[in-house]
Amino acid sequence: SEVEYRAEVGQNAYLPCFYTPAAPGNLVPVCWGKGACPVFECGNVVLRTDERDVNYWTSRYWLNGDFRKGDVSLTIENVTLADSGIYCCRIQIPGIMNDEKFNLKLVIKPAKVTPAPTRQRDFTAAFPRMLTTRGHGPAETQTLGSLPDINLTQISTLANELRDSRLANDLRDSGATIRIG
């Protein structure tokens, strides 16, 4: 079953997904899609990376972490109830049926009514965008001379909500990870 993550309407949601590149810059294509992972790639793609860069993304979806180090966790900006559902993170490891796919369930709750406004840290400022290119058609990929020996890690559910960027940092840097493969 899918690991569940929660956010409130108006907040930024964080869906963790990680892998460990065999060497710096030796990246693996990754896609994020709305909906469970299908047989190939991702359905309803919201973001893609290739061996070099983020080559496609849609508004409100971006990578805050250092994807060049394997942090391909997805941030969804200013969520609404319509953002609820299953998301697919697919790490496309070269080889015969080697893809690692993770289905993450995002639950959006209505915003809490508070008696007085409280100042929250700016998630975007804490995690500046790292996206540098935008694709307008299918990506050109470069064939790597040798296939990377990849160890994947997927972070476990440590908290139901990410309230601010400090907690996001704590989660990402925590040792409580599951090693796949």
Epitope: P38, V39, F40, V45, T58, P94, G135, A139
Partner: antibody, heavy 123, light 107 residues
């Protein structure tokens, strides 16, 4: 106009080998997943194997992956299926098909198919 | 493997009829379902993908519906060129699997 033309089929004895080819034209071949699907005489469709854009990721029907190898040559706009240790039950028309694709979708269904090439395995 | 079961396996109908073919998946496949049409001696043709999206160039008399495990393809008013075999295909689980087919014949 998108065209997929298979070749390489024919009669082969059990235990023999064949290499099927699919020549693609009318589109940027390297942008698309490609797939082989087969159809035994009078029967339904059966997925055989698929390959990603640059050939680094391949996917097979479990029962075939030890005998069949899918590959591609993007410089030649060609898809291949190497079939070894052929059996009578491999007798079928083999179709090459293009995975429908644009950036917001996944290539899990097939929008263009070749005319097929018949492989007959018989002694 | 996910099993796809089509019904009926064959169907006789007349030009102008409304017909529905159903496809049942052995487990939840969300909306990851495709329909193809195949005429004798020809290669399959994509009709509907993601359960309900009509492929380019497919007449609007064709429509797809369903999600989860139950799906259907409806032809609102049969035309002579619609008599053919129809296959569903799931693309949620590996391996990709097809239904056994439905043969649509002229009554």
């Amino acid at each position: 106009e998108v065209q997929l033309v298979e070749s390489g089929g024919g009669l082969v004895k059990p235990g023999g080998s064949l290499r099927l080819s699919c020549a693609a034209s009318g589109f940027t071949f390297s942008d698309y997943y490609m797939t082989w699907v087969r159809q035994a005489p009078g029967k339904g469709l059966e997925w055989v194997a698929s390959i990603n854009y640059d050939g680094r990721n391949t996917y097979y029907l479990d029962s075939l992956k030890s005998r069949f190898t899918i590959s591609r040559d993007n410089a030649k706009n060609s898809l291949y299926l190497q079939m070894n240790s052929l059996r009578a039950e491999d007798t079928a028309v083999y179709y090459c098909a293009r995975g429908y694709y644009y950036y917001g979708s996944s290539p899990n269904y097939f929008d263009y198919w070749g005319q097929g090439t018949l492989v007959t395995v018989s002694s | 493997d996910i099993q796809m079961t089509q019904s009926p396996s064959s169907l006789s109908a007349s030009v102008g009829d409304r017909v529905t073919i159903t496809c049942r998946a052995s487990e939840n496949i969300y909306s990851y379902l495709t329909w193809y049409q195949q005429k004798p001696g020809k290669s399959p043709k994509l009709l509907v993908y993601n359960a309900k999206t009509l492929a380019e160039g497919v007449p609007s008399r064709f429509s797809g519906s369903g999600s989860g495990t139950q799906f259907s393809l409806t032809i609102s008013s049969l035309q002579p060129e619609d008599f053919a075999n129809y296959y569903c295909q799931q693309h949620y689980g590996t391996p990709l699997t097809f239904g056994q087919g439905t043969k649509l014949e002229i009554k």
